[in-house]
């Protein structure tokens, strides 16, 4: 899948984790579409 960034923001999330995608793992499943 493809994601175009630059039009949305997650800076208001309360989580203290980074909003970037975590490191890939072999358990990662490809999103439909």
């Amino acid at each position: 899948s493809e994601t175009t960034t630059g039009t949305s923001s997650n800076s208001s999330q309360s989580t203290s984790n980074s909003g970037l995608a975590p490191n890939p793992t072999n358990a990662t499943t490809k999103a439909a579409g």
Epitope: S1, E2, T3, T5, G6, S9, N10, S11, S16, S18, G19, L20, A21, P22, N23, P24, T25, N26, T28, T29, K30, A31
Partner: antibody
Framework: QVQLVQSGAEVKKPGASVKVSCKAS????????MNWVRQAPGQGLEWMGE????????YFNQKFKSRVTMTRDTSISTAYMELSRLRSDDTAVYYC???????????WGQGTTVTVSS | DIQLTQSPSFLSASVGDRVTITCRAS??????LAWYQQKPGKAPKLLIY???TLHSGIPSRFRGSGSGTEFTLTISSLQPEDFATYYC?????????FGQGTKLEIK
């Protein structure tokens, strides 16, 4: 040790495409996103996008979405970035960089100079 | 998109000086700011990530601090090899954004 080795310099005409390769060694290629960053002469750093080497999922800078194609070949631990419809202002050094989730862009290729000139 | 503003854009200093570079974000990026050093003709090199964590092999004279919207990079005692351009970069959300850079020159 981690190494990212990029393909050599390119000279292209306006309207053409360029494909830059980035061969990784010294780590598990599938364990980290590969990012692409460019730097025009005398200018700052501009993020273009990244690819997940397992799923091929991609995140793009909106500015490049319509012109950039990011691919990878896990069998040879190599990522590719193709930029189409080149213009003179695409003249820049193009870098690949490994992104570690907590650490950000921790290892970089040596850069590939792309010159667009008629 | 988050915007990052570095100040100053140019900085002249001498070997042994203590220098500070500031990076301000247009919205909170928690602690997720990285700092890079770039020398002419070379790729950027990661110095600090997550605001204050020193990357492996980076000398302890480099120190990062801050969170939210204001961050600083301090070099406690400048060495000749430290004269370069420094960039901040947020790694809190997409799109990944860099500051415009700070060129550190020898006075």
């Amino acid at each position: 040790q981690v190494q990212l080795v990029q393909s050599g310099a390119e000279v292209k005409k306006p309207g053409a495409s360029v494909k830059v390769s980035c061969k990784a060694s010294g780590y598990d290629f599938t364990g980290y996103h590969m990012n692409w960053v460019r730097q025009a002469p005398g200018q700052g750093l501009e993020w273009m996008g990244e690819i997940n080497p397992i799923t091929s999922d991609k995140y793009f800078n909106q500015k490049f979405k319509s012109r950039v194609t990011m691919t990878r070949d896990t069998s040879i631990s190599t990522a590719y970035m193709e930029l189409s419809r080149l213009r003179s202002d695409d003249t820049a050094v193009y870098y690949c960089a490994r992104r570690d989730y907590g650490t950000s862009l921790d290892y970089w290729g040596q850069g590939t100079t792309v010159t667009v000139s008629s | 998109d988050i915007q990052l503003t570095q100040s100053p854009s140019f900085l002249s200093a001498s070997v042994g000086d203590r220098v500070t570079i500031t990076c301000r974000a247009s919205a909170s990026i928690s602690k997720y700011l990285a700092w890079y050093q770039q020398k002419p003709g070379k790729a950027p090199k990661l110095l600090i990530y997550a605001g204050s964590t020193l990357h492996s092999g980076i000398p302890s004279r480099f120190r990062g601090s801050g969170s939210g919207t204001e961050f600083t990079l301090t070099i406690s005692s400048l060495q000749p090899e430290d004269f370069a351009t420094y960039y901040c970069q947020q790694h809190n959300e997409y799109p990944i954004i860099f500051g415009q850079g700070t060129k550190l020159e020898i006075k």
